[in-house]
């Protein structure tokens, strides 16, 4: 999906108002320097492409994210403020449903969380004024 | 600890060029825009200018914009700000200052600030 | 450039007592429902330290005596109880467009 046509700002409206927050608490306990950042991005277009994939795509290690409380309104801001999205979204939700499985919060998803967080950081906060 | 250290005081001739260091610790550095602001005596708060340091992106205050340069050196989590063409009413108070966490836009850590004079 | 105007420059107010800042942006500092002004305290020789964030949401760590409202254009910072601790200068901070701008400062005094 190609997300230069979201609207930026009430994406960022959503994360500060609700998501920020519910990475926060699943973040829980865990110190801000335990792991380091290892993926970034350039532009806002691009952070969502690593947000969406850090969020919904199960990797080695932690295969659970997308049922997490901040993975949905994550998806409801796309859906919402992204044209298009949804559809694009359906057979990997139906792929998603196949595969449920029990949550575990693993050290691999708190590294990836906090990834995520990075990644949300420098979305809402982008040097606008490139020199 | 999270924290930002920030050079010593410096003293400087009008037109001569002064840099000032920030070094971070405590958090992971090259993922926060870190900001420049000044303070003259007796006066409030001039923003600088911002650096992205996991790209080096920079957004410049054109107030400073032809005099002044933000670089940082990942590899020992340290920002700078030089500025140029010094004259008295550079004279100030610089400090560094870290975004917040989640990108709500404050400046969450500040260094301790470095006072730099320009007198002939 | 987004000017900030604080009022009043300076303040004294007798311990116990409210205290009001204000703080007016030459232009709507709103953004998708959300107000990006900052508040922050500066004590003599001291960096800034945020108070408030995002014009209404406390800042970590301080007390529940401050409180900020406001939306678009004009914001306003409360003491409901003023402490002699809370001798300082209080600035607002815009950070919706750049370049980030701040108010001239409101100094504030005991009576």
């Known amino acids: 999906y190609d997300f230069t046509n979201c609207d930026f700002e009430k994406i960022k409206a959503a994360y500060l108002s609700t998501i920020s927050k519910d990475l926060i608490t699943y973040m829980s306990g865990t110190k801000s320097t335990e792991f380091n950042n290892t993926v970034s991005c350039s532009n806002r277009p691009h952070c969502l492409t690593e947000i969406q994939s850090l969020t919904f795509n199960p990797t080695a290690g932690c295969a659970s994210l997308a049922k997490e409380m901040f993975a949905m309104k994550t998806k409801a801001a796309l859906a919402i403020w992204c044209p298009g999205y949804s559809e694009t979204q359906i057979n990997a939700t139906q792929a998603m449903k196949k595969r449920r499985k029990r949550k575990v919060t693993t050290n691999k998803c708190l590294e990836q969380v906090s990834q995520l967080q990075g990644l949300w950081r420098r979305f809402n906060r982008p040097l606008l004024k490139q020199q | 600890e999270v924290q930002l250290v920030q050079s010593g005081a410096e003293v400087k001739k009008p037109g001569s060029s002064v840099k000032v260091s920030c070094k971070a610790s405590g958090f992971t550095f090259s993922t926060y825009n870190m900001h420049w602001v000044r303070q003259a005596p007796g006066q409030g708060l001039e923003w600088m200018g911002a650096i992205y340091p996991g790209n080096g992106e920079t957004s410049y205050n054109q107030k400073f914009k032809d005099r002044v340069t933000l670089t940082v050196d990942k590899s020992t989590s340290t920002a700078y700000m030089e500025l140029s063409s010094l004259r008295s009413e550079d004279t100030a108070v610089y400090y560094c200052?870290?975004?917040?966490?989640?990108?709500?836009?404050?400046?969450?850590?500040w260094g301790q600030g470095t006072t730099v004079t320009v007198s002939s | 450039d987004i000017v900030m105007t604080q009022s009043p420059d300076s303040l004294a107010v007798s311990l116990g007592e409210r205290a009001t800042i204000n703080c007016r942006a030459s232009?709507?500092?709103?953004?998708?429902?959300?107000?990006?002004m900052h508040w922050y305290q500066q004590k003599p020789g001291q960096p800034p330290k945020l108070l408030i964030y995002r014009a209404s949401n406390l800042g970590s760590g301080v007390p529940d005596r401050f409180s900020g409202s406001g939306s678009g254009t004009d914001f306003t910072l409360t003491i409901s109880s003023l402490q002699a601790e809370d001798v300082a200068v209080y600035y607002c901070?815009?950070?919706?467009?750049?370049?980030?701008?701040f108010g001239q400062g409101t100094k504030l005094e005991i009576k």
């Open positions: 232009e709507s500092v709103d953004n998708s429902g959300l107000s990006f």
């Open positions: 200052a870290r975004e917040d966490d989640y990108g709500e836009g404050y400046f969450d850590v």
């Open positions: 901070q815009q950070i919706n467009t750049d370049p980030l701008t």
